[in-house]
């Protein structure tokens, strides 16, 4: 009688992560008597995958009933496949022996490859905000995919970026891989509403790439422009001075009025108006009682935006043309943009 052969008909099997792998194996004879075992890998370090008679293998089921007298089908199914299951699987026939069974013949092996989807790309920007014209770096990471081939693209508002560097790790063979990419983006004043997108394409995604996004509103700081103007006299001895704070982002802003270098009033931007580009405008005014001043007054609008060093704009108020009220020692009357004080 011809000597038993162990046949593994599939050289390779490709399975998606989470699915079930079927590893086929048949024997050509019932003799010698002894069990079949499945191993991953060869040599002394091989890992036992299934033993039909002993051990706990909750993920493995047999395709046919191994207890049937004339059974020669030793195929198995492995459930809930992960990238860690990749490798070459051997179906091995043992001959009953004493004290231990003896390996008799092995199949040629079946290579199990696992396709695993990349995780959703995570895009992160710089820790601190930056101003227009500066270049900032964004990183994109995705993990756990297999096989190694992957494509990553960067976009800003739908326009593909070219200044980026990408690494796929590890370099050698692995059960799964990670991708890390860093893109450089030049900020403009119009970027408050802009988005940076990292797009990952992989064979497991069937042409529907995964995207990760970052809003530049989290990254950009647009400093305000200031304009101080003197309004027509509202009443005798009173002058209304306004400070226009334009095109700033984010909203966090504190404004201080100074009269000849002395703090007159401090307020925080609240009722702002939003521009189409996402930046904000705000206006503050100061009602100055000119009769309280003997000399010209230097009015300064000082703005601290988003924790940055203050910027200021000054306006010289001529008081010589105004009659002076005797006996008044009031320097100025302060009102916010939504207050009106009448004396």
């Amino acid at each position: 009688e011809e000597e038993l052969q162990v046949i593994q008909p599939d050289k390779s099997v490709l399975v998606a992560a989470g699915e079930t792998a079927t590893l086929r194996c048949t024997a050509t004879s019932l003799i010698p008597v002894g069990p079949i075992q499945w191993f991953r890998g060869a040599g002394p370090g091989r890992e036992l995958i299934y033993n039909q008679k002993e051990g706990h293998f909750p993920r493995v089921t047999t395709v046919s009933d191994l207890t049937k007298r004339n059974n020669m089908d030793f195929s198995i199914r492995i459930g809930n496949i992960t990238p860690a299951d990749a490798g070459t699987y051997y179906c091995v026939k043992f001959r009953k022996g004493s004290p231990d069974d003896v390996e008799f013949k092995s199949g040629a092996g079946t290579e199990l490859s696992v396709r695993a989807k990349p995780s959703a790309p995570v895009v992160s920007g710089p820790a601190a905000r930056a101003t227009p014209q500066h270049t900032v770096s964004f990183t994109c990471e995705s993990h756990g995919f297999s096989p190694r081939d992957i494509t990553l693209k960067w976009f800003k508002n739908g326009n593909e970026l070219s200044d980026f560097q990408t690494n796929v790790d590890p370099v050698g063979e692995s059960v799964s891989y990670s991708i890390h990419s860093t893109a450089k983006v030049v900020l403009t004043r119009e970027d408050v509403h802009s988005q940076v997108i990292c797009e990952v394409a992989h064979v497991t995604l069937q042409g529907d790439p995964l995207r990760g996004t970052a809003n530049l509103s989290e990254t950009i700081r647009v400093p305000p422009t200031l304009e101080v103007t003197q309004q027509p006299v509202r009443a005798e001895n009173q002058v209304n001075v306004t400070c226009q704070v334009r095109k700033f982002y984010p909203q966090r802003l504190q404004l201080t009025w100074l009269e000849n270098g002395n703090v007159s009033r401090t307020e925080t931007a609240s009722t702002v108006t939003e521009n189409k580009d996402g930046t904000y405008n705000w206006m503050s005014w100061l009602l100055v009682n000119v009769s309280a001043h003997r000399d010209d007054v230097k009015l300064t609008c000082q703005v601290e935006h988003d924790g940055q060093p203050a910027v200021s704009k000054s306006h010289d108020l001529k008081v010589s043309a105004h009659p002076k009220e005797q006996g008044s020692n009031t320097a100025a009357e302060n009102t916010g943009s939504n207050e009106r004080n009448i004396y």
């Epitope: 890992e47 207890t67 231990d100």
Partner: antibody, heavy 114, light 108 residues
Amino acid sequence: QVQLVQSGAEVKKPGASVKVSCKASGFNFEDTYMHWVRQAPGQGLEWMGRIDPADGDTKYNPKFQDRVTITVDTSTNTAYMELSSLRSEDTAVYYCVRGNYVNWGQGTTVTVSS
Amino acid sequence: EIVLTQSPGTLSLSPGERATLSCRASSSVSSSYLYWYQQKPGQAPRLLIYSTSNLASGIPDRFSGSGSGTDFTLTISRLEPEDFAVYYCHQWYSYPRTFGGGTKVEIK
């Protein structure tokens, strides 16, 4: 569900034999080996031997080789462990264990006393 | 035969503490064949970990196993009141199958 139900407690005299049964249900009895493990009072676990219910093939711990016999009756899905020439140190709880090592019988207490 | 030596014999710890149990084999055991059990008084042993590091069904993930060759470890990251029991390692790599002598984890 898988169950291994063992026979009741036994009290034996030194030199006698004891036969403990283990009735299996909830799985294909011939699928896996059936092991026997014992535990003396306050002691650890000791493997005695196993049988392949499909063909009756047995393996024994050399310590018990001459005194233990493991058999099966596939018509009733029952495994048996017989220990002869009992001595006081054979006083223990005897467990049958399915080949997957997950399913254990409830244990049978065998007391050997004169 | 492969002799499995467990240490320490007794481990006295408080709930919430980390327990590290050792099992040393007299000759190399392939990790696929090294199992751990938990046994409480009056009960049959319960399979805890199979193939050195895989949790059996229903076993909480505070239990973990590691090791290779001749040195294996069972770790309980944070002891719960129900974890105080005796733990056994077991090899079925070669005949005769053997168990370690056990480690008793008791409340301090």
